[in-house]
């Protein structure tokens, strides 16, 4: 018996050869003996089958002796044995349909977890063979599960179900909601314009949810809210924003926050939570500021950075086209009796210069000038 | 019987894009998986890339800047792209198809051999 | 990435022989690992698939078996044709190759 596979939703075409090369009477039946259709002459006539509707044949083949049976838009329950009757015999075809599909939806929240379900016949014993997009292989039965979704999860699934040595293959586009980003730092001068800027990775028609920024400060001893809004078709609404400080943001994607002034005070990490309309679950993406400060005091020129530095990071004090005269992995430094001239303060991570902050030092009679 | 065949240059000039196409005969391109292997001359075997039933593609992330992958399903054809060659690049490369998506290649090309030299 | 090894680069064996060639895995590849044969005029073969189903044609002398980062190729009895040089490769993600046991005739 010959076995084919089909596909839910798909088109099959079960073939039936005769011997003689020309038109003559065939029929197919199903395993109950109910007739699906046959000829009459140059006619195709059709029996009482619930395939009725959606199976057809390819007149144009029959007088090469081939008389197909074409069954569109398969289900699952279509699964059965189809029996083609020509010249006295009997060709016997079983048809396994599949269906493969991700639960529930197809945009799924960074960390979610994507389940697919295979539908098969009862009686079958498929396993399935699915790749991610980034080329890892899972496999599985019935259902096929991948927990913590990663952005790189995002595309095109590709799936083979195999039984009997004997193959269907799936395609399932999945969409992985995320920031593009989990996590970014921005470095300014004290005093400096600070941009927040949160990417999304994707791209949906209409976009529509709440958000808020929540700001734990270095100095300060819990977090709290800066700002709350309303996200709808992808424009961007100010719901509540604190008084200090006064946060702008954004009114179109991607979601852009502008913080006038930094200063040590703001210094510190945020988070900020994106609820999606009809998602459980939110998207976060932190964010962090760190502050630098260089200031001259009497004969004490230090520099200073306020927020979340790696201890790798190093901090120097030099005068411009000179050796570092001080440099730490510390968050302060200072150097006494600075010589007159224009002073570096330097905050770098493997040499790369992160952040960099100039002061002018006048001959001690002279007030210091920033430039 | 499903039988690859890979052709074009045997000798390609350092810099240049080497280009390879594998023609697939006893199956359609527009079902399994179909990858390129090369061999280096002391038999390390790399795997370079695939492209899929789906259209989709993956490569090798060492080669990611410099590769590309394509298809034509009216010839029944896969091609290979490998931009800004070296010396290093010279291999026997094989094209091959994986049927049930294991990466486990069931049928190879006899290779061809590509020299990168001035 | 995942790295898998080959321990042994050659190995000498006598015709009726039972041959075992292993190969690791730098983590679980949850029996994704393929074995294949090159013979000495460049002819590649898939030989064993997903640690140990038979591909079509392939005799059953070579057998396969392993789980999570260990696996090994049998060859039940060494016959004349076998003399090649065996690769195992993962593809639990995108595939890596063992550096190659060259098996020749004692």
């Known amino acids: 018996k010959k076995v084919v596979l089909g596909k839910k939703g798909d088109t099959v075409e079960l073939t039936c050869t005769a011997s003689q090369k020309k038109s003559i009477q065939f029929h197919w039946k199903n395993s109950n003996q109910i007739k699906i259709l046959g000829n009459q002459g140059s006619f195709l006539t059709k029996g009482p089958s619930k395939l009725n509707d959606r199976a057809d044949s390819r007149r144009s083949l029959w007088d090469q002796g081939n008389f197909p049976l074409i069954i569109k838009n398969l289900k699952i329950e279509d699964s059965d044995t189809y029996i083609c009757e020509v010249e006295d015999q009997k060709e016997e075809v079983q048809l396994l349909v599949f269906g493969l599909t991700a639960n529930s939806d197809t945009h799924l929240l960074q960390g979610q977890s994507l389940t697919l379900t295979l539908e098969s016949p009862p009686g079958s014993s498929p396993s399935v063979q699915c790749r991610s997009p980034r080329g890892k292989n899972i496999q599985g039965g019935k259902t096929l599960s991948v927990s913590q979704l990663e952005l790189q999860d995002s595309g095109t699934w590709t799936c083979t179900v195999l039984q009997n040595q004997k193959k269907v293959e799936f395609k399932i586009d999945i969409v992985v909601l995320a920031f593009q980003k989990a996590s970014s730092i921005v470095y300014k001068k004290e005093g400096e314009q600070v941009e927040f800027s949160f990417p999304l990775a994707f791209t949906v028609e209409k976009l529509t949810g709440s958000g808020e920024l929540w700001w734990q400060a270095e100095r300060a001893s819990s977090s709290k809210s800066w700002i709350t809004f309303d996200l709808k078709n992808k424009e961007v609404s100010v719901k509540r924003v604190t008084q200090d400080p006064k946060l702008q943001m954004g009114k179109k994607l991607p979601l852009h926050l502008t913080l006038p002034q930094a200063l040590p005070q703001y210094a510190g990490s945020g988070n900020l939570t994106l609820a999606l309309e009809a998602k459980t679950g939110k998207l976060h993406q932190e964010v962090n500021l760190v502050v630098m400060r260089a200031t001259q005091l009497q004969k004490n020129l230090t520099c200073e950075v306020w927020g979340p530095t790696s201890p790798k990071l190093m901090l120097s004090l030099k005068l411009e086209n000179k050796e570092a005269k001080v440099s730490k992995r510390e968050k302060a430094v200072w150097v006494l009796n600075p010589e007159a001239g224009m002073w570096q303060c330097l905050l770098s991570d493997s040499g790369q210069v992160l952040l960099e902050s100039n002061i002018k030092v006048l001959p001690t009679w002279s007030t210091p000038v920033q430039p | 019987e499903v039988q690859l065949e890979e052709s074009g240059p045997s000798l390609v000039k350092p810099s240049q894009t080497l280009s390879l196409t594998c023609s697939v005969t006893?199956?359609?391109?527009?079902?399994?998986?179909w990858n390129w292997i090369r061999k280096f001359p002391g038999h390390k075997l790399e795997f370079l890339g695939y492209i899929s039933f789906a259209d989709t593609t993956n490569y090798n992330p060492s080669l990611k800047s410099r590769i590309s992958i394509t298809r034509d399903t009216s010839k029944n054809q896969f091609d290979l792209q490998l931009k800004s060659v070296t010396t290093e690049d010279t291999a026997t490369y094989y094209c091959a198809r994986d049927d049930f998506g294991y990466y486990a290649m069931d049928y190879w090309g006899q290779g061809i051999s590509v020299t990168v030299s001035s | 990435d995942i790295y898998v090894t080959q321990t042994t680069s050659s190995l000498s064996a006598s015709l009726g022989d039972r041959v075992t060639i292993i190969c690791r895995a730098s983590q679980d590849i949850n029996n994704y690992l393929n074995w294949y044969q090159l013979k000495p005029d460049g002819t590649l073969k898939l030989l064993i698939y997903?640690?140990?189903r038979l591909h079509s044609g392939v005799p059953s002398r070579f057998g396969g078996s392993g789980s999570g980062t260990e696996y090994s190729l049998t060859i039940s009895n060494l016959e004349q044709e076998d003399v090649a040089t065996y690769f195992c490769q993962q593809g639990n993600t995108l595939p890596t190759f063992g550096a190659g046991t060259k098996l020749e005739l004692k």
């Open positions: 006893g199956d359609s391109i527009t079902s399994s998986y």
């Open positions: 997903y640690t140990s």
